[in-house]
Interface confidence: low
């Protein structure tokens, strides 16, 4: 870009005309304060383009900056803009006017700023004074610009004399504001409503002072205009909140809320949303899922939890085989609905110290005045194994016997095995398994019983062993899932006489 | 208008992972009003429900794939997916993906256009 | 799981006639605190996907047309035609949303006679 004449200063006449001209390669334009000016544009044959801003008339308002820049200068490098200053030295211009926005500064932090006071004529000397004060303040001054420096909270004036007569500039303030990173939080009073019940949702905004709310909402996006309520919350320093109010809420209102808030001091910005639903009638339903069949572990505690969502809050309870549960004086049952989230429940049963008897079939049930849910599982009672009896016999048969029983829930399995070096066993050598050899030294037979009152399993297992000639340690081991259980025996040889 | 489009492979060895996308359009899957579903119908059967999602990432499925499917969300690209590990010729059928309300319980009121998918090696 | 089955397999009516399908649970998917049975009627055609019907067991989806209509309560449910048309051949199926698992019955075929 080329501007000629080039500048980047001009001081000119009042009541003259200038001709100034900015050439390119691309087409050019002549803008002041952001606005484009009446100009003449051209094209030369050697593909330059050029722009002719012919000013005329001139007064001490046509004091200022001058930007010639390409037409289309979205994304161009600010090299790519170029920058001229006019003075048009008047008597009858004092300062030149400002903005109302200009005469207000506010500062969010301790930083250099521009009181920009500006005249005609860059040969006038010009002082700044607090307003109540006729002391000039040590702080640089640029024509073009104004004075910089840094600024109390306080009320300033410029002045300057013109031939004989002393001016005074409009007054300018100076406010220090409270403004930080702009930090929204939106809640809701609920969530999800029926229809017919209150959407109310508050936006709240901390550590600023002067900021703008704007809310979109579903119903905003028919036409249908809320307006929301702004105040203070007077026992926290800078907290402003806006509240939105629909009453009496429509299927329709369901959808996403968004609070924008806006600071227009560093124009920082920032905005939370929040989901609300409104529903035809009331809900339950079930998170997740629990087993059909779960298990206890016998004097041990167990909790059994149910996760489910509901709106509006449910009423819980509990039934083992059609018979409500409560909470047990002695403590042997604990019932206990949490409300983790707004919509979301956790209900526990907790069985203190388990027992057999508190086997059988539960049920949850959560239920309001338009939905309900129920859960049902079968509860069994795992009871570690344990070996009752041991004993060995010399049936007339000639053979030994040695006879293992033992319960547990659920069903043990037993294991038969023997050591031969009575010295040496069980620890070094592993004990050679019996019942599951083809050999015709031993038999196994082994009966189950279920005991319905106790809800446990009873194993009996009688091991034959056909020749034993010498000293045999026999060990039964039962297993379950919740244990394992064991005892050993000494079978002798019939020729022994002593065991 | 509310819009649901399955895409992912038509063909899948045995023994591999299928999987599936599910892109909403003309609404979002981030609204607190819906659960999104799974849907399948193997050729000449019946249609069968594999599981469904909330978008903040609540999942249910059907006990009998339970041990095989995921159902997972991306609300950020609007979509959510399906994974059935351990494939065989039997879960070779056509894949939907379906809304339904969160309310006591309710219908699949919007289905997409359904996928086919063999199994076969 | 609620099991879902349906009558008849398949049926053909003549145009204009009243076509009858019947669904069963094996278990009531009627929740008495609200009175509503938490049955689904779905039309599905060759090539596209399901089309809700009916829902609540008898109140009709949006755009439906009024020859639909569905009855029952409990565990016995009925899908009527009122009067058929070229357009309504299609397999229909119902479906139970009580409780998880969602379950659906084995579809009824109709054709025209």
């Known amino acids: 870009l080329v501007i000629t004449p080039p500048g980047p200063e001009l001081i000119l006449n009042v009541s003259s005309t200038f001709v100034l001209t900015c050439s390119g390669s691309a087409p050019v334009v002549w803008e002041r304060m952001s606005q484009e000016l009446p100009q003449e544009m051209a094209k030369a044959q050697d593909n330059t383009f050029s722009s002719v801003l012919t000013l005329t008339n001139l007064t001490g308002l046509d004091t200022g900056e001058y930007f010639c820049t390409y037409n289309d200068s979205r994304g161009l490098e600010p090299d790519e803009r170029k920058r001229l200053y006019i003075f048009v030295p008047d008597p009858t211009v004092g300062f030149l006017p400002n903005d109302a926005e200009e005469l207000f500064i506010f500062l969010t932090e301790i930083t250099e700023i521009t009181i920009p006071c500006r005249v005609t004529d860059p040969q006038l000397v010009v002082t700044l004074h607090e307003k109540k004060g006729d002391i000039a303040l040590p702080v640089p001054y640029d024509h073009q610009r104004g004075f910089s420096g840094i600024f109390e909270d306080r009320s300033y004036i410029c002045k300057t004399t013109i031939g004989d007569r002393e001016v005074d500039s409009d007054a300018y303030y100076v406010y220090r504001l409270q403004v930080s990173s702009i930090n929204v939080s939106v809640n809701a009073v609920q969530t999800v409503v029926r229809q017919g019940e209150n959407i109310t949702l508050m936006c709240i905004v901390i550590g600023n002072e002067v900021v703008n709310f704007e809310w979109m909402y579903p119903r905003k996006e028919s036409g249908r205009l809320v307006e929301p309520v702004t105040d203070f919350l007077l026992d926290m320093p800078y907290h402003i909140r806006s509240i939105l109010h629909i009453p009496s809420a429509e299927l329709e209102d369901s959808g996403t809320y968004t609070c924008n808030v806006t600071e227009s001091v560093n124009d920082h910005q920032d905005e939370k949303a929040i989901n609300i639903t409104v529903v035809e009638s009331g809900y339950v339903r079930l998170l997740g899922e629990v087993g059909a069949l779960q298990f206890a572990e016998l004097h041990r505690s167990r909790t059994l939890q149910v996760v489910f969502e509901a709106y509006p809050p449910p009423t819980v309870l509990w039934f083992k085989d059609n018979r409500t549960l409560g909470d047990s004086s002695a403590g042997e049952i604990a019932l206990s609905t949490r409300n983790v989230s707004e919509t979301r429940y956790v209900s526990e049963l907790t069985l203190v110290r388990v027992k057999v008897a508190e086997a059988g079939h539960y049920t949850m049930r959560a239920f309001h005045e338009d939905a309900e849910v129920q859960l049902s599982f079968q509860l069994q009672i795992n009871v570690p194994v344990r070996v009752l009896e041991l004993s060995e016999s010399h049936p007339d048969s000639g053979e030994q016997t040695v006879r293992c029983r033992g319960r547990g829930m659920p069903q043990p399995n037993i294991i038969w095995s023997a050591c031969r070096d009575l010295k040496r066993c069980p620890r070094e050598l592993p004990p050679m398994l019996l019942g599951n050899s083809s050999e015709e030294e031993s038999q196994l037979e082994t009966n189950v019983t279920y005991w319905e009152e106790e809800q446990e399993f009873e194993v009996v297992s009688t091991l034959r062993l056909q020749h034993v000639d010498r000293p045999l340690s026999v060990r039964c081991t039962l297993r379950n899932a919740v244990g394992q259980d064991m005892q050993e025996v000494i079978v002798v040889p019939h020729s022994l006489p002593f065991k | 208008q509310l819009q649901l489009q399955e895409s992912g492979p038509g063909l899948v060895k045995p023994s591999e992972t299928l999987s599936l996308t599910c892109i909403v359009s003309g609404g979002s899957i981030s609204s607190s009003s819906y659960y999104w579903g799974w849907i399948r119908q193997p050729p000449g059967k019946g249609l069968e429900w594999i599981g469904s999602?909330?978008?903040?990432?609540?999942?249910f499925y059907n006990p009998s794939l339970k041990s095989r499917v995921t159902i997972s969300v991306d609300t950020s690209k609007n979509q959510f997916s399906l994974t059935l590990t351990s494939v065989t010729a039997a879960d070779t059928a056509v894949f939907y993906c379906?809304?339904?309300?969160?309310?006591?319980?309710?219908?699949?009121?919007?289905w997409g256009q359904g996928t086919l998918v063999t199994v076969s090696s | 799981d609620i099991v879902m089955t349906q009558s008849p397999e398949s049926l053909a009516v003549s145009l204009g006639e009243r076509a009858t399908i019947n669904c069963k649970s094996s278990q009531s998917i009627l929740y008495s605190s609200n009175n509503k049975n938490y049955l689904a009627w779905y039309q599905l055609k060759p090539g596209q996907p399901p089309n809700l019907l009916i829902y609540?067991?008898?109140t009709r989806e949006s755009g439906v047309p009024d020859r639909f209509s569905g009855s029952g309560s409990g565990t016995d449910f009925t899908l009527t035609i009122g009067s058929l048309q070229a357009e309504d051949v299609a397999v229909y199926y119902c479906?139970?949303?009580?409780?998880?698992?969602?379950?659906f019955g084995p579809g009824t075929k109709v054709d025209i006679k």
């Open positions: 999602l909330y978008y903040s990432g609540i999942t």
């Open positions: 479906q139970q949303y009580y409780s998880t698992p969602f379950t």
């Open positions: 609540w067991a008898s």
């Open positions: 379906a809304r339904h309300r969160v309310m006591a319980s309710s219908p699949f009121d919007h």
